[in-house]
């Protein structure tokens, strides 16, 4: 439940972190899991225990294997598992799968490579970045803090990216590599009529007399960046502007969030102090964008 | 206003089982441990079970195999399902907040109790 | 499992004079982390538990300062300077540092 496949290459460094969460003043505990024998945290040893982290400087083929740490939190201690697995090196330029990190996609706009596990070393930029084994050069390349940006990123762009730093351990340095792969995938956009997710037509909302309450208009329209997209709310087909009634007010500005791709706007109408004569208003949330406008209802009716 | 409320005791067969809720809000409830205390009628407090952000379960050896704790994340829930019910089970039930593991120094114990919710166990 | 043990059970108290109650511990409630995981709560009648202390001596926020925890190890100490009327209830002392077990109370009424 609790257990981290890490792995590495021998003659380079690599840490581990414990998969329990914990706090700085919490001590863990390290173990070869199998012998039960506990993992030093003098940094003279070649693999020693250092808080949340397991530190092989360098790692050897011999390190492979389930290490446990255990958390020793107040109340309950926390027990988790690292898998660790260090792998000769390869003779020729290629990566096996075995030793790829997470695949990332990228596009024309964002085209971000992060160096994985990086954040776990003690690192001084900057970092080497490859593609395919073959150092990168030219203004396109990027190398920032611990990522890569490619400037107009081509689907030719895709591939097999290593970053190699070196990890600072007392004076002693120790070199790291790592390699995932990069998809470039087309970012096209697209608008439609606009889809009205709340409220529901012709919903009625239970409200109590005096108390506040609040309606939220929110519809998507299409995916991607929208030219035109808008939500409001009219009270009897008037803007809200038109209808001078301080209790009621719409929300300034609109709030923009993309679900599942989809851009998606909101806007919330706002009630103080809810009176009867509220109960008699239509209130309509309008979608609109260069498709059209669409409208839904919705009525307040009194709470039993 | 941070806030805990328990739901769903109530009168249950020995043998028979039950299932508590408790509703948060006010706080990120995601990042504490959660917890469930009883108390028997003119009796002290009695922990029973706890869950850790991470999903982690731990219980008493009085429940043990008979109840399972459990949380809802996006719901700001905690759950303890109750089986195989027995006399001793009479209690009220409260649902309680404990560490924070967002923030590296807060330890206050068990700092907020919801107003309990009551479990009878009898035929 | 860690034991709590709490004296006096009961006490009857003056208002405005002092109390004192005493909690022990069957082991040591020092974590490695140098914290003592040992907290008192007050049970008013037909209300949950509210936090007064923790961390043996550190006052919960909104905990009036007539309320005064000490101790260390395996014996704790909670101090009323003056009782008022509104501090009747069951106080328990709790320790978190393996699982939770809280001392059988001790019920304070006022003379």
């Known amino acids: 439940k609790f257990s981290k496949q890490s792995w590495g290459l021998e003659n380079e460094a690599l840490i581990v972190r414990c998969p329990r969460q914990g706090k700085s003043s919490y001590i863990v505990d390290w173990y070869y899991s199998q012998t039960n024998k506990s993992i030093p945290t003098q940094e003279r040893n070649r693999v020693f225990a250092s808080g949340q982290l397991l530190k092989f400087l360098p790692a050897e083929v011999a390190d492979s294997g389930i290490y446990t740490c255990i958390v020793r939190s107040p109340t309950f201690n926390r027990t988790g598992y690292a898998n660790v697995t260090i792998y000769k090196k390869q003779p020729d330029c290629n990566v096996p799968d075995y030793l790829m990190y997470s695949t990332v996609s990228g596009s024309e706009k964002n085209s971000k490579i992060y160096c994985p596990t990086i954040d776990l070393y003690n690192w001084t930029a900057p970092l080497e970045w490859f593609k395919n084994c073959q150092a990168l050069q030219g203004s396109r390349y990027k190398a920032h803090k611990s990522f890569l940006v490619i400037d107009n990123v081509m689907t030719d762009d895709a591939g097999d990216y290593t970053c190699k730093f070196i990890h600072n351990e007392n004076g002693a340095n120790y070199s790291v590599t790592a390699t995932r792969s990069f998809t470039v995938k087309d970012e096209q956009g697209f608008s439609r009529f606009p889809v009205i997710r709340a409220p529901a037509h012709n919903e009625t909302k239970e409200v109590e007399i005096g108390e506040n309450t609040n309606l939220t208009c929110s519809a998507c329209f299409g995916k991607g960046a929208q030219f035109l997209a808008t939500v409001q709310w009219q009270l009897n087909g008037n803007k809200i502007t038109d209808f001078s009634e301080p209790r009621i007010q719409q929300e300034e500005g609109q709030n923009q969030s993309f679900s599942n791709g989809l851009a998606c706007v909101n806007t919330v109408l706002r009630i103080a102090d809810v009176k009867e004569e509220d109960l008699l208003l239509r209130y309509d949330c309008l979608a609109l964008n260069l498709h059209g406008l669409r409208r839904h209802t919705i009525r307040l009716s009194r709470k039993n | 206003e941070v806030q805990l409320v328990e739901s769903g005791g109530g009168l249950v067969q020995p043998g028979g089982s039950l299932r508590l809720s408790c509703a948060a809000s006010?706080?990120?409830?995601?990042?504490?441990?959660m917890h469930w205390v009883r108390q028997a009628t003119g009796k002290g407090l009695e922990w029973v079970s706890s869950?850790?952000?991470?999903?982690?379960?731990y219980y008493s050896g009085s429940v043990k195999g008979r109840f399972t704790i459990s949380r809802e994340n996006a719901r700001n829930s905690l759950y303890l399902q109750m089986n195989s019910l027995r006399a001793g089970d009479t209690a009220v039930y409260y649902c309680?907040?404990?560490?924070?593991?967002?923030?590296?120094?807060?330890?206050?114990?068990?700092?907020?109790w919801g107003q309990g919710t009551t479990v009878t166990v009898s035929s | 499992n860690i034991v709590m043990t709490q004296t006096p059970l009961s006490l009857s108290v003056t208002p405005g004079q002092p109390a004192s109650i005493s909690c022990k511990s069957s082991q040591s409630l020092l974590h490695s982390d140098g914290k003592t995981y040992l907290f008192w709560y007050l049970q008013k009648p037909g209300q949950p538990p509210q936090l007064l202390i923790y961390g043996v001596s550190n006052r919960f926020s909104g905990v009036p300062d007539r309320f005064s925890g000490s101790g260390s190890g395996t014996d704790f100490t909670l101090k009323i300077s003056r009782v008022e009327a509104e501090d009747v209830g069951v106080y328990y002392c709790?320790?978190?540092?393996?699982?939770?077990?809280f001392g059988p109370g001790t019920k304070v009424e006022i003379k």
């Open positions: 309680t907040r404990g560490e924070d593991w967002s923030d590296d120094d807060y330890y206050y114990g068990l700092d907020v």
């Open positions: 869950i850790d952000t991470e999903g982690d379960t």
């Open positions: 709790m320790q978190s540092l393996q699982l939770f077990t």
């Open positions: 006010g706080f990120t409830f995601s990042t504490f441990d």
